[in-house]
């Protein structure tokens, strides 16, 4: 699925939906892009509890084990992000896998990513006839990270 | 920095370069989106070695620490992507920092980012009028985790 | 008009340092998508990248030479350097820099579309 | 680390006969970049992009390939074609130039 550019317009860059095409269905073939987090949602449950697994994907075998939680607006590229939730305030031991241990952290990694949204273009909010891809950044939890905490000078 | 969507062309999306504008600035502006990675980059030094901070970045306090390195392509958006390279084959032990832990493993954490490339479009290369913008997943380290060795069934 | 135009010390000592500079005109280093690489070619063989430096300062070098390179750039005299650690003598080659920046209707080139007339360096004891 | 294989190393051909040069990319790649060297004198771009012609290049050059395998064809060599040509590519991470070996044509 791609973006046709072509020279003439008064913006950069302007887009057109297609005529053959349902907008509607080709919006969402275009703006869907990837559905999945980075370890599949389908074994998620594991990481429910605080404690690390010794199977399953990683967010449920780290010791600052996360679940995911889908983040899904159908007027963004890419329409479904998903933000990693920590499901402990601390590490998990590596030992036990279970007990926590206060000397680390389990936090957040953010990551401001790049989405576009549809959007009326500005000052045609009546005509109907144009949208806007808007470019944004828009702050997302990659995964949990156990850290020492950090010690102030 | 938006892109222009407009009814009536033949191809979903169709877009235009800016007339008013120099491409390459414009093209830049739009395509350059954020270009730092989820931590300064200005403070990776911290995390070059395999230790665990205590200050610094969340990358540099991590016990499973790792650098970050730049992916540039002019020709995709985001240009700039950043893939975390893990310092420590283990985790470092939360007590001292420095020495490793054999009990758990520093391990990349991968995603599939949606990215849009630059393309010349599909049986127009000699026309120079048009160029398209292809989505693609690439695939990213996002950060290193501390995870508990997998144990086979 | 682009020019190009290397200078350098001619001989050096080994575990010396090369310094060379690159003069550039017809085009600005401050340009969006604009950049300048060094290139080197032992005599009778093949071309060698050595070092990437962008319009904003990011700089790129190759991975097996990174601990002894060293990019920078000068805007306002339109002069980028690079210098090399502790030359060896199969550091003995002609030394290019070229441009790379070139917007077509598809995107960026990642080829050297200018380069410089090369300046000859030798490593010798 | 891409490496790029070309091959032959060397070659000649007799004026009106067809040249082919090829390069091997040890993974895939999009594009390859090629570049003529004659002696004395600073490589000058040749073929953009896998095969656009830079400017001033006969149309008797032409270039094509894609994945791992790319070539440089002459349709029809003429003295002046003698050189040597290296293929080139960029690969953004790690952001690295890469170039072939290059091959030395000769006439015959």
């Known amino acids: 699925v791609s973006l046709r550019i072509q020279e003439g317009c008064s913006h950069l860059p302007s887009c057109c939906p297609s005529k053959e095409q349902e907008p509607p269905e080709e919006w969402l073939k275009w703006s869907s892009a990837s559905v999945s987090p980075p370890e599949p949602l389908s074994h998620t449950h594991h990481a429910e509890s605080c404690r690390a697994s010794k199977d399953g994907p990683l967010n449920s075998r780290a010791i600052s084990p996360w679940s995911y939680e889908l983040d899904r607006d159908l007027n963004r590229v890419p329409q479904d992000l998903y933000h990693a939730r920590c499901l402990c305030p601390h590490c998990v031991s590596l030992q036990t896998g279970s007990h926590m241990d206060p000397l680390g952290n389990s936090v957040p990694l953010y990551h401001n990513q790049t989405v576009f949204y549809r959007r009326p273009c500005h000052g045609e909010e009546g005509t109907h006839r144009r949208y806007c891809l808007e470019r944004r950044l828009y702050r997302v939890s990659l995964a949990c990270v156990c850290v020492r905490p950090r010690v102030m000078a | 920095v938006s892109l222009r969507i407009q009814e009536g062309c033949s191809h979903l999306p169709s877009c235009c370069p800016s007339k008013e504008q120099e491409p390459p600035e414009e093209w830049l502006k739009w395509s350059s989106a954020s270009v730092s990675p989820p931590e300064p980059l200005s403070h990776t030094h911290h995390a070059e070695s395999c230790r665990a901070s205590k200050d610094g970045p969340l990358n540099s306090r991590a016990i499973s620490p790792w650098s970050y390195e730049l992916d540039r392509d002019l020709n995709r958006v985001p240009q700039d992507l950043y893939h975390a390279r893990c310092l420590c084959p283990h985790c470092v032990s939360l007590q001292t920092g420095s020495h490793m832990d054999p009990l758990g493993n520093s391990v990349p954490l991968y995603h599939n980012q949606t990215v849009f490339y630059r393309r010349p479009c599909h049986g127009e290369e000699g026309t120079h009028r048009r160029y398209c913008l292809e989505r693609r997943l690439y695939r990213v380290s996002l950060a290193c985790v501390c995870v508990r060795p997998r144990v086979m069934a | 008009q682009v020019t190009l135009k290397e200078s350098g010390p001619g001989i050096l000592q080994p575990s010396q340092t090369l310094s060379l500079t690159c003069s550039f005109s017809?085009?600005?280093?401050?340009?969006?998508?604009?950049?300048l690489g060094w290139i080197r070619q032992p005599s009778g063989k093949g071309l060698e990248w050595l070092a990437h430096?962008?319009?904003?300062?990011?700089?790129h070098y190759k991975p097996a030479l990174k601990s002894r390179l060293t990019i920078s750039k000068d805007i306002s005299s339109s002069q980028v350097f690079l210098t090399i650690a502790s030359v060896d003598t199969a550091d003995t080659a002609t030394y290019y820099c070229?441009?790379?920046?070139?917007?077509?209707?598809?995107?960026?080139?990642?080829?050297?579309?200018?380069w410089g007339q090369g300046t000859s360096v030798t490593v010798s004891s | 680390q891409i490496v790029l294989t070309q091959s032959p190393a060397i070659m000649s051909a007799s004026p009106g006969e067809k040249v082919t040069i090829s390069c091997s990319a040890s993974s895939s790649v999009s594009y390859m970049y090629w570049y003529q060297q004659k002696p004395g004198s600073s490589p000058k771009p040749w073929i953009y992009r896998t095969s656009n012609l830079a400017s001033g290049v006969p149309a008797r050059f032409s270039g094509s390939g894609s994945g791992t395998s790319y070539s440089l064809t002459i349709s029809s060599m003429e003295a002046e074609d003698a050189a040597t040509y290296y293929c080139q590519l960029y690969h953004s991470y790690p952001p690295t130039w890469t170039f072939g070996g290059g091959t030395k044509l000769e006439i015959k």
């Open positions: 430096i962008w319009w904003d300062d990011v700089k």
């Open positions: 070229a441009r790379m920046g070139q917007l077509h209707y598809y995107g960026y080139d990642y080829a050297m579309d200018y």
């Open positions: 017809g085009f600005s280093l401050s340009t969006s998508g604009m950049g």
